[in-house]
């Protein structure tokens, strides 16, 4: 079974990721950031 | 392919003015966000400000807000900064610098030297 | 607060390999971050970004000698079979966004030495 530690590592592993992605997308959209 | 050619640069006392510019070609200008990054005498990279593709959006450090104005006129594939109320610690390099979609910084300029000298 | 830390100084070989590392503050130990090179009097150029898990992307131009990895809290820029053109600052970078508000930092860089 994954840990509950896993899950919450798995999550904060691609969090900051998304956000930089997402971020790079809005300066090229200019989509709003909230 | 891509260039970024800085200009503007040069002596200025503190507290005056002085406009950077960034002449962009071999990319279509309009469709990237642009930066502006320093490097005093030196020392390390800063990032200075950053302008989405239209204009519409700008950010900036606490070091500079309020001072400094990142700006863009896509018709002359030109990216501008605005400093304002400069101080010895602004000396430095500026460099600009063009996104991807999969990074800040991806192309760089060659830099132009402001020194902020009375 | 978001802190890159990095050696101010490294030296290898000619034709050798060096890895040189990137720290991330503790609390930022899963952040993707980006790899600079610069060279004496020149612009910074753009390296790769490197991930969490060691998977990076590299700039255009960057020959396959450059690679990164990473673990937990570090992330390394490994050149290998170095040639003389490779002596230049290396300098790590990550942005985050926060409230709608961008920040991007910067290490100190690792002036690197390429001994002959």
């Known amino acids: 079974a994954v840990s509950e530690h896993q899950l919450l590592h798995d999550k904060g592993k691609s969090i900051q990721d998304l956000r930089r992605r997402f971020f790079l997308h809005h300066l090229i959209a200019e989509i709003h950031t909230a | 392919q891509v260039q970024l050619v800085e200009s503007g640069g040069g002596v200025v006392q503190p507290g005056r003015s002085l406009r950077l510019s960034c002449a962009a070609s071999?990319?279509?200008?309009?469709?990237?966000?642009m930066s502006w990054v320093r490097q005093a005498p030196g020392k390390g990279l800063e990032w200075v400000a950053t302008i989405s593709s239209g204009g519409s959006y700008t950010y900036y450090p606490d070091s500079v807000k309020g001072r400094f104005t990142i700006s863009r006129d896509n018709s002359k594939n030109t990216l501008y900064l605005q400093m304002n109320s400069l101080r010895a610690e602004d000396t430095a390099v500026y460099y600009c610098a063009r996104q991807t979609t999969m990074t800040y910084f991806a192309y760089w300029g060659q830099g132009t030297l402001v020194t902020v000298s009375s | 607060q978001l802190v890159l830390t990095q050696s101010p100084s490294a030296s290898a070989s000619l034709g050798a390999s060096v890895k040189l590392t990137c720290t991330l503050s503790?609390?930022?130990?899963?952040?993707?971050i980006e790899w600079y090179q610069q060279q004496p009097e020149k612009g910074p150029r753009y390296v790769m970004d490197?991930?969490?898990?060691?998977?990076?992307s590299t700039g255009d131009g960057i020959p396959d000698r450059f690679s990164g990895s990473s673990s937990g809290a570090e992330r390394y820029l490994t050149i290998s079979s170095l040639q003389s053109e490779d002596e230049a600052d290396y300098i790590c970078g990550v942005g985050d966004t926060i409230k709608e508000q961008f920040v991007y930092v910067f290490g100190g860089g690792t002036k690197l030495t390429v001994l002959g």
């Open positions: 071999g990319f279509t200008f309009s469709s990237y966000g």
């Open positions: 503790s609390q930022h130990s899963t952040y993707t």
């Open positions: 490197l991930k969490q898990d060691g998977s990076h």
